[in-house]
């Protein structure tokens, strides 16, 4: 006959660990049910009767099987230089990434805590390396033969026109100009348009809280009796 | 035995402020919710809020923001109310309590009594 | 904020009664609901919570029910240490709040 199937709450066999999306709780001394995603333990379990789970607050939520006593406040709102690519739900906390043309200068374990603009390079020096998500765009000046006429965080130095016969020589910060005949572009090796920084913010697929010591109120939250209840592994 | 060992009673002016202290034993300090319950003479109870000693995050009931402040001291296991610029209002016994979850309060201190009077 | 009523402020009964004190919500409050004891010393002890779960310690002559808005506590068997106040508390919804309280005599 197969072995009978505990129900919670149970005292488990010495030396072995509750089951899945289940708990030891210290007090009762009983293996108990955990609260799903989006639910909190407002009554704790004793030895005859289990956990009791509530749906988490508005602006609040529990992204893992757990037994917080409090649901984590979702993170305020995303500020202007930033978008919501992840909205506040029982569920998930809110997660905010910077706007094209940004990029995030303090991030945190989802989205980013601070914006920067990404550094424009300006006339005579030209994007050595992109801007990305998480780093501002590196400039250097143009090298002799290339150009830079624009101040932008994607140009990069193009090499001069090649005159027949030229007007004006090119410096850094300007292109040669030839006279009547029409000019051939030279190509200097190199001399290719780098990618525009990517836009649309790609956002983390396996989020994991952070720790309750963290500066942003949104996750100082009471996290119940040790282990961390959230996060905990057995999910 | 869990204890919540309470300061002694208190008479002050009006307008003054004052800090209640509860010196909490014989459990887990920072596992545990501290609220702060009001009574006034021959009334019910009301809950002023409370405090999570683990990472010192409160919360209060609206009538009583900017009235009182909890704040706890892990390393003497013991929590705080300061409550600011008093009136005749403000006299009562002020009882602290644990909770595990943050609703229902198993363990009481014994009461301070407030007496704001010039 | 939640409103608690305890519509009996005082009742007095003998020792060995049986005594039901009823404690109504202004809304359901989800079987969320305690119940405490005052003795005449101000002492509070915590008596049953979440409507019907005796806490440790407390005999087993007390006892709790309801659900939606009306709760009860009932002591099954009067004894002349269970002479306080008692008071019934949601958790349903912040702010908690109290009934006015039930004070018990003994006849």
């Known amino acids: 006959l197969p072995a009978q199937v505990a129900f919670t709450p149970y005292a488990p066999e010495p030396g072995s660990t509750c089951r899945l999306r289940e708990y030891y709780d210290q007090t009762a001394q009983m293996c108990c049910s955990k609260c799903s995603p989006g639910q909190h333990a407002k009554v704790f379990c004793t030895k005859t009767s289990d956990t009791v789970c509530d749906s988490c607050e508005d602006s609040t939520y529990t992204q893992l099987w757990n037994w917080v006593p409090e649901c984590l406040s979702c993170g305020s709102r995303c500020s202007s230089d930033q978008v919501e690519t992840q909205a506040c739900t029982r569920e998930q906390n809110r997660i905010c990434t910077c706007r094209p043309g940004w990029y995030c200068a303090l991030s945190k374990q989802e989205g980013c805590r601070l914006c920067a603009p990404l550094r424009k390079c300006r006339p005579g020096f030209g994007v050595a390396r992109p801007g990305t998500e998480t780093s501002d765009v590196v400039c250097k000046p143009c090298a002799p033969g290339t150009f830079s006429n624009t101040t932008s965080s994607t140009d990069i130095c193009r090499p001069h026109q090649i005159c027949n016969v030229v007007a004006i020589p090119g410096n850094a910060s300007m292109d040669a100009v030839c006279t009547s005949t029409s000019p051939t572009r030279s190509m200097a090796p190199g001399a290719v348009h780098l990618p525009q920084p990517v836009s649309t913010r790609s956002q983390h697929t396996q989020p994991t809280p952070e720790p309750s010591t963290a500066p942003s109120t949104s996750f100082l939250l009471p996290m119940g009796p040790s282990p961390p209840a959230e996060g905990s592994t057995g999910d | 035995q869990v204890q919540l060992q309470q300061s002694g009673p208190e008479l002050v002016k009006p307008g003054a402020s004052v800090t209640i202290s509860c010196k909490a034993s014989?459990?887990?300090?920072?596992?545990?919710?501290i609220h702060w319950v009001k009574q006034r003479p021959g009334q019910g109870l009301e809950w002023i809020g409370w405090i999570y000693p683990g990472n010192v995050i409160t919360k209060y009931h609206e009538k009583f923001k900017g009235k009182a402040i909890l704040t706890a001291d892990t390393s003497s296991t013991t929590a705080y109310m300061q409550l600011n610029s008093l009136t005749s209002e403000d006299s009562a016994v002020y009882f602290c309590?644990?909770?595990?979850?943050?609703?229902?309060?198993?363990?009481w201190g014994q009461g301070t009594t407030l007496t704001v009077s010039s | 904020d939640i409103q608690m009523t305890q519509t009996t402020s005082s009742l007095s009964a003998s020792l060995g009664d049986r005594v039901t004190i009823s404690c109504r919500a202004s809304q359901d409050i989800r079987n969320y609901l305690n119940w405490f004891q005052q003795k005449p010393d101000g002492t509070i002890k915590l008596l049953i919570y979440y409507t019907s779960r005796l806490h440790s310690g407390v005999p087993s002559r007390f006892s709790g029910s309801g659900s939606g808005t009306d709760y009860s506590l009932t002591i099954s068997n009067l004894e002349q240490e269970d002479m306080a106040t008692y008071f019934c508390?949601?958790?349903?919804?912040?702010?908690?709040?109290f009934g006015g309280g039930t004070k018990l005599e003994i006849k």
């Open positions: 014989d459990y887990s300090f920072t596992n545990y919710y």
């Open positions: 508390q949601q958790f349903n919804t912040l702010p908690w709040t």
């Open positions: 309590a644990r909770s595990r979850a943050t609703g229902y309060f198993d363990y």
